[in-house]
């Protein structure tokens, strides 16, 4: 249950996540299974641990193995194994279905391909993309921070697309390439727990008091239509329309959207002339359909304005 | 939603044991830890111990070790807390609970009606 | 095992006070979590990792503090706020409560 499948490329960077959480607070330990031997964690180590993190800078295919974490809470010690494959490079331009991460579906009106697992990684902008091993070129495609936009899809738009960037360890620079397939047709649907994309739990957002400020919430629910799916904020555990303070809006109505094809629903959190008072307020994006609900907290802290006197 | 019903009210003799069930529904029952707390009357909250029922794993207050068993029913999704030995101080209301989301251990948000055990001779 | 001390024990107070409850561990601890007992009911967990409200707890209840020191603020105290309240840490084993502190209305 608590397994999770990895893999990358040989010489490239490869960062996997236990697939255990905690608080940050809790120590995590990482071993080889077949040796039981310790992950190091100082990070001279070409293989290291960091917390909830295994990196492998770079990955060679002798690293190839289960990998188990251990999260030591007060009560127990919660186990976790990364199954980690790590292949040699291909020479031609086909990328094998053992290196496709999940097929995601885009329609006429939205299609945004998300790159795989790239939220574990320390990368900067610009973000490569690739289709059928070609650079994509032209205004329809879109780089837009980790994902890419195509506008005005159409069934050729289908095919195997790879983001490209670099991953930053102190000071060194590792590549990293992820590929999924793409089509582009109606899915059969269904409905999983909600998983918030936006914004990361216990987000520390920062506002300009005077200035307005927009918060959005993000999560998805399944393929397809979804019965029942919500996104909503609320303000120190209350609903916003019963907190009372006019400044905080949620944007009425709720955004679908498809991404790794699968349904998700956006509501923006709109703040008006921030003030000293919002920053003590608690923000929880909550997302909930049949399966449950989840929920992440986001606070919110000053930012000096820069001072562009000399 | 999720639910947490416990067994019924107990009386008990000094020296013996009680096993309190709680049966769980509304979430996966191995997705979840589950604690157990005690309330003896007029007194404060006291942990007594946890079971993990995917691995049947257990953690104790020391307290208690030696004391209590723990074990859970994966089949019904029923967890037990059996206390032996029982004597008078014992007497107490007995919860089971468990987090909001188990990894991160962000403090008991359900529970159960809990069960009153009266050790009496 | 990490002992909790909460403080004052009782207090009396009026609706619409600003009401504030202490907790002092005899270690440091990462977070602290704080519940609402009722005469014969469950605990109601209102505050999670110091100072994270529960869901649909109202917005008068607060939490703050760090290391050895935690507080837990009412801030404008309404007459269905009478119970009992603890504060409990998850940062070692034993899990522990403080002894509770009981609210009652002026």
């Known amino acids: 249950k608590f397994s999770k499948q990895s893999w990358g490329l040989e010489n490239e960077a490869l960062i996997v996540r236990c697939p255990r959480q905690g608080k940050p607070s809790y120590t995590v330990d990482w071993y080889y299974s077949q040796t039981n031997k310790s992950i190091p964690t100082q990070e001279r180590n070409r293989v290291f641990a960091s917390g909830q993190l295994l990196k492998f800078l770079p990955a060679a295919v002798a690293d190839s193995g289960i990998y188990t974490c251990i999260v030591r809470s007060p009560t127990f010690n919660r186990t976790g194994y990364a199954n980690v494959t790590i292949y040699k490079k291909q020479s031609d331009c086909n990328v094998p279905d053992y290196l496709m991460y999940s097929t995601v579906s885009g329609s006429e009106k939205n299609s945004k391909i998300y790159c795989p697992t790239i939220d574990l990684y320390n990368w900067t902008a610009p973000l490569e993309w690739f289709k059928n091993c070609q650079a994509l070129q032209g205004s329809r495609y879109r780089a837009h921070k980790s994902f890419l936009v195509i506008d005005n899809v159409m069934t050729e738009d289908a095919g195997d697309y790879t983001c490209k960037f670099i991953h930053n360890e102190n000071g060194a620079n590792y590549s990293v390439t992820a590929t999924r397939s793409f089509t582009v047709k109606d899915e059969q649907g269904f409905s999983l727990f909600p998983v918030i994309g936006a914004p990361a739990q216990n987000e520390i957002k920062e506002v300009e008091i005077g200035k307005n400020a927009n918060l959005t919430c993000s999560a998805c629910f399944g393929k397809g239509t979804q019965f029942l799916a919500a996104v909503l904020w609320q303000l120190n555990g209350t609903k916003i329309t019963d907190f009372g303070e006019p400044r905080i809006q949620q944007e009425e109505g709720q955004n679908q959207s498809f991404s790794n094809g699968l349904a998700c629903l956006d509501m923006v959190l709109r703040i008006a002339d921030v003030k000293e008072e919002d920053l003590l307020l608690q923000y929880d994006c909550l997302a909930l359909n049949l399966h449950g609900l989840r929920r992440h907290t986001v606070r919110l802290s000053r930012k000096n304005p820069i001072d562009h006197h000399s | 939603q999720v639910q947490l019903v416990q067994s019924g009210a107990e009386v008990k003799k000094p020296g013996a044991s009680v096993k309190v069930s709680c049966k769980a529904s509304?979430?996966?029952?191995?997705?979840?830890?589950m604690y157990w707390v005690r309330q003896a009357p007029g007194q404060g909250l006291e942990w007594m111990g946890a079971?993990?029922?995917?691995?049947?794993?257990?953690a104790f207050n020391q307290k208690f070790k030696g004391r209590v068993t723990m074990t859970a029913d994966k089949s019904t999704s029923t967890a037990y807390m059996e206390l032996s030995s029982l004597r008078s101080e014992d007497t107490a209301v007995y919860y089971c609970?468990?987090?909001?989301?188990?990894?991160?251990?962000?403090?008991?948000?359900?529970w159960g009606q809990g069960t009153m055990v009266t050790v009496s001779s | 095992d990490i002992q909790m001390t909460q403080s004052p024990s009782s207090l009396s107070a009026s609706v619409g006070d600003r009401v504030t409850i202490t907790c002092s561990a005899s270690?440091?601890?990462?977070?602290m979590h704080w519940y609402q007992q009722k005469p014969g009911k469950a605990p109601k967990l209102l505050i999670y990792?110091?100072?994270k409200l529960a869901s649909g707890v109202p917005s008068r209840f607060s939490g703050s503090g760090s290391g050895t020191d935690f507080t837990f603020t009412i801030s404008s105290l309404q007459p269905e706020d009478i119970a009992t309240y603890y504060c409990?840490?998850?940062?070692?084993?034993?899990?522990?409560f403080g002894q509770g502190t009981k609210l009652e209305i002026k």
């Open positions: 270690s440091s601890v990462n977070y």
């Open positions: 609970t468990r987090a909001f989301d188990n990894d991160n251990d962000d403090g008991f948000a359900y």
């Open positions: 409990q840490q998850w940062s070692s084993n034993p899990l522990t």
């Open positions: 509304g979430y996966t029952f191995t997705d979840s830890e």
């Open positions: 990792d110091t100072s």
């Open positions: 079971i993990d029922p995917e691995t049947g794993d257990t």
